[in-house]
């Protein structure tokens, strides 16, 4: 099943994120990725725990999943590099960066976001966008089309309190509010954008989505600067 | 139909403290961001701050964050700012207001606001 | 913090006509531009957010365009009611902050 979805969200403007990645197993979405270099895209590491015997590839330059569209063109996968600290049990480090097998053709719909470098904290009640292809409400409705939600950051003293992520959230994660709207399973891996660069990475940890009580979780990338640059070099 | 009522406002001395309600109703009050926002006589709109969902965070203008605090009752429906040592520059028409649903910080309803003198 | 400048501060135009009133950002905020319309001694009214979506209840006679860091607020074939005074607000981020109004009298 997708890992990951987009409660109480709106479709998203055609195109407007020309970053966005759908990471499929299969032929079917799977998660959420955001294109950080011509032939680079991040997700999250968690994606591929179950996906060892299948086909990975990626999704670019889409808006629908299933509709034929000028810009759409799915990548094989040349290498998936999931970070090394990254185990089935934890959220913690839960990166993955996946090697297109050529470069991506650049144009309006598909184009790299800039990613966060400097190591520090998005101000609590800053609005970031999150989007994704995941199911949409609590019966399981997936969306054809690309979906965003606006959510605000989250302190992380707020995120740890024992009603919420009692302590879980270590500095190299950060919190988004979940009331009503929020990110979830399903759309693990994607992007959270907050002033147009590229600030977290949607956690494929399994939570209740939709509760204020259970902020999403979000890997802060400014945190992998180092890792990341490594792999892309 | 959306309502938001402010309490009265009214005089009160430099260095002293007031506390301003604001009662809503026609939505569920917990499913909203709300503000406080105030207005100088014949001047502009400056936003005092915000406060979350369920209270856990609240958000202030920098020069007000050490007098002012919001605070909400969910189970009554009433947002509240709490304004202590009060200087003469805080004399203003106070307004609270909703967050729109989606975009928080762009506000969809006000109150009819409250008057506040700050003088001795 | 973000600054917002609007301009022009005070207008002039008579019933019928179409006005254009300005608005910038002293960074960029995308699309995150509300507009309010206050009449003299009552609230504000949000008539326009997220750029160019309107309020519930406004006339399509309003409309918002721009993006990044210049905006405007177009009002074609004012009414009477219209007349008052327009903020424009970002709402990007903490702290949200106004323009400081343009004042739109009947000539």
């Known amino acids: 099943p997708p890992r990951g979805r987009i409660l109480g969200g709106r479709e998203a403007e055609a195109h407007a994120r020309p970053y966005m990645a759908s990471v499929q197993l299969n032929g079917a979405h799977l998660c959420g990725g955001v294109l950080v270099a011509e032939q680079w895209v991040l997700s999250a590491a968690h994606c591929l725990e179950d996906a060892a015997d299948g086909k990975v590839q990626v999704l670019l330059g889409a808006h629908s999943l299933s509709q034929p569209e000028p810009s759409k063109r799915l990548y094989d996968v040349l290498r998936a590099v999931p970070h090394p600290d990254s185990q089935p049990d934890t959220i913690d480090h839960d990166l993955l960066l996946l090697q297109l097998s050529e470069k991506a053709t650049l144009g309006p719909a598909v184009r790299p976001l800039p990613w966060q470098r400097v190591d520090r904290d998005v101000a609590p009640g800053t609005l970031c966008d999150v989007a994704g292809w995941g199911i949409v409400n609590h019966a399981g409705r997936r969306p054809d089309s690309l979906q965003h939600v606006l959510l605000p950051v989250l302190d992380r003293a707020t995120c740890n309190r024992r009603t919420h992520h009692d302590g879980a959230i270590t500095e190299r994660l950060m919190c988004a509010e979940s009331n009503r709207r929020d990110s979830c399973k399903g759309d693990s891996g994607g992007p959270l954008v907050c002033g147009g660069v590229l600030e977290g990475v949607v956690t494929s940890g399994s939570r209740v989505c939709g509760n204020r009580k259970k902020p999403g979780i979000y890997t802060r990338v400014a945190s992998y600067a180092a890792w990341i640059d490594s792999v892309l070099a | 139909e959306v309502k938001l009522v402010e309490s009265e406002g009214g005089l009160v001395q430099p260095g002293s403290s007031m506390k301003l309600s604001c009662t809503a109703s026609?939505?569920?009050?917990?499913?909203?961001?709300m503000a406080w926002v105030r207005q100088v006589p014949e001047k502009g709109l400056e936003w005092v701050g915000n406060?979350?969902?369920?209270?856990?965070?609240?958000y202030y203008l920098d020069s007000l964050k050490s007098r002012f605090i919001i605070s909400r009752d969910s189970a009554k429906n009433i947002l509240y700012l709490q304004m202590s040592s009060l200087k003469s520059e805080d004399t203003a028409t106070y307004f609270c207001?909703?967050?729109?649903?989606?975009?928080?910080?762009?506000?969809?309803?006000w109150g009819q606001g409250t008057s506040v003198t700050v003088s001795s | 913090d973000i600054q917002m400048t609007q301009s022009p501060a005070s207008l002039s135009a008579s019933v019928g006509e179409t006005v254009t009133i300005t608005c910038r950002a002293s960074?960029?905020?995308?699309?995150?531009l509300a507009w309010y319309q206050q009449k003299q001694g009552k609230s504000p009214q949000l008539i326009v957010y997220?750029?160019?979506t309107l309020a519930e209840g406004v006339p399509s006679r309003f409309s918002g365009s721009g993006s990044g860091t210049q905006f405007s607020l177009k009002i074609n074939s004012l009414q009477p009611e219209d007349f008052g005074s327009y903020y424009c607000?970002?709402?990007?981020?903490?702290?949200?902050?106004f323009g400081g109004g343009t004042k739109l009298e009947i000539k």
């Open positions: 207001a909703r967050g729109e649903d989606f975009y928080l910080y762009a506000m969809d309803y």
């Open positions: 026609g939505f569920t009050f917990s499913d909203y961001y």
């Open positions: 406060i979350n969902y369920d209270g856990s965070s609240t």
């Open positions: 960074e960029n905020i995308h699309s995150y």
């Open positions: 997220n750029t160019k």
């Open positions: 607000q970002h709402h990007y981020g903490i702290p949200p902050t």
